[in-house]
């Protein structure tokens, strides 16, 4: 996920809409002026925001990489939400990339867990149950299997 | 406790500039997220500028975009806000002020109007 024009955009154009700030705060989909004195609208499909604020400027909107599909897209209130592509995830150690889920468990363990957008299929132990630690077995050690279907969008 | 310290300001002509500095004590100066407001008489206090604890992010008013510039100085625990080309309508107290609870997205530092500890003000007058 990448952030779009990192560099600060003018806001307050003559047709955003405007209001009062209640309370000091703009509520979500809008930011406050450089004065306080008024709530602007943010931009649909560039930037937004999700709570009541004091912001001098709505968050940006952020793009889907290569890799990743998007699920919604950006509106004032809501960032996009981008999911990994069917056979790929994303850790949670690791969430600016999203990578490969593994084939096949390692001799000796069985799949207990497909894989999905933010997990690795998960291989167990036969005997012991316990989890294995998973880096990529070399191919003669792999017993295959085919990626599982992204389930539901992970937020 | 953050404190500010300013400098800097006076009196100075049209078409002039001035550089304001704002010095921090009390915290470590690289965690801080900064912003210089001002305020007119009888006017409400208006954002300037701000800048990210590691100056990648900065953001500026409409109005003072390409005449103003904000900067940092990590090691010297000080901002600074240059001004050039100085109009009668920039004449108002100056504020530093800090986040004690920034917000961040996707890395990138938002500021916001309601920033938290203030230093004591400046005043800038510009002559026609």
């Known amino acids: 996920i990448t952030q779009q024009d990192l560099a600060p955009q003018q806001r307050a154009a003559p047709q955003q809409k405007r209001s009062s700030p209640s309370e000091g705060l703009c509520p979500p989909g809008h930011h406050i002026s450089e004065d306080g004195r008024d709530c602007i609208s943010c931009k649909y499909g560039q930037d937004y925001s999700t709570h009541w604020n004091d912001l001098l400027f709505c968050l940006r909107c952020t793009r889907c990489d290569s890799g990743e599909v998007e699920l919604s897209p950006c509106t004032t209130t809501r960032n996009t939400v981008c999911q990994c592509e069917e056979g790929t995830f994303r850790e949670e150690d690791s969430p600016e990339m999203c990578r490969k889920c593994r084939t096949g468990c390692p001799r000796g363990m069985v799949k207990v867990g497909d894989c999905t957008p933010w997990s690795d299929i998960e291989c167990v132990h036969k005997e012991s149950g316990t989890k294995h630690s998973g880096e990529v077995p070399a191919v003669e050690e792999t017993v295959t299997s085919s990626p599982g279907t992204p389930a539901s969008p992970c937020s | 406790e953050v404190q500010l310290v300013q400098s800097g300001g006076g009196l100075v002509q049209a078409g002039g500039s001035l550089r304001l500095s704002c010095a921090a004590s009390g915290s470590t100066f690289s965690s801080l997220d900064m912003g210089w407001f001002r305020q007119a008489p009888g006017k409400e206090r208006a954002f300037v500028a701000a800048?990210?604890?590691?100056?990648?992010?900065?953001y500026y008013a409409e109005s003072v975009k390409g005449r103003f510039t904000i900067s940092r100085d990590n090691a010297e625990n000080t901002m600074y806000l240059q001004m050039n080309s100085l109009k009668p309508e920039d004449s108002a107290v100056y504020y530093c002020a800090v986040e004690s609870q920034p917000t961040y997205s996707g890395g990138v530092y938002y500021p916001r109007y309601g920033m938290d500890v203030w230093g004591q003000g400046t005043q800038v007058t510009v002559s026609s």
């Open positions: 800048i990210s604890r590691s100056g990648d992010n900065i």
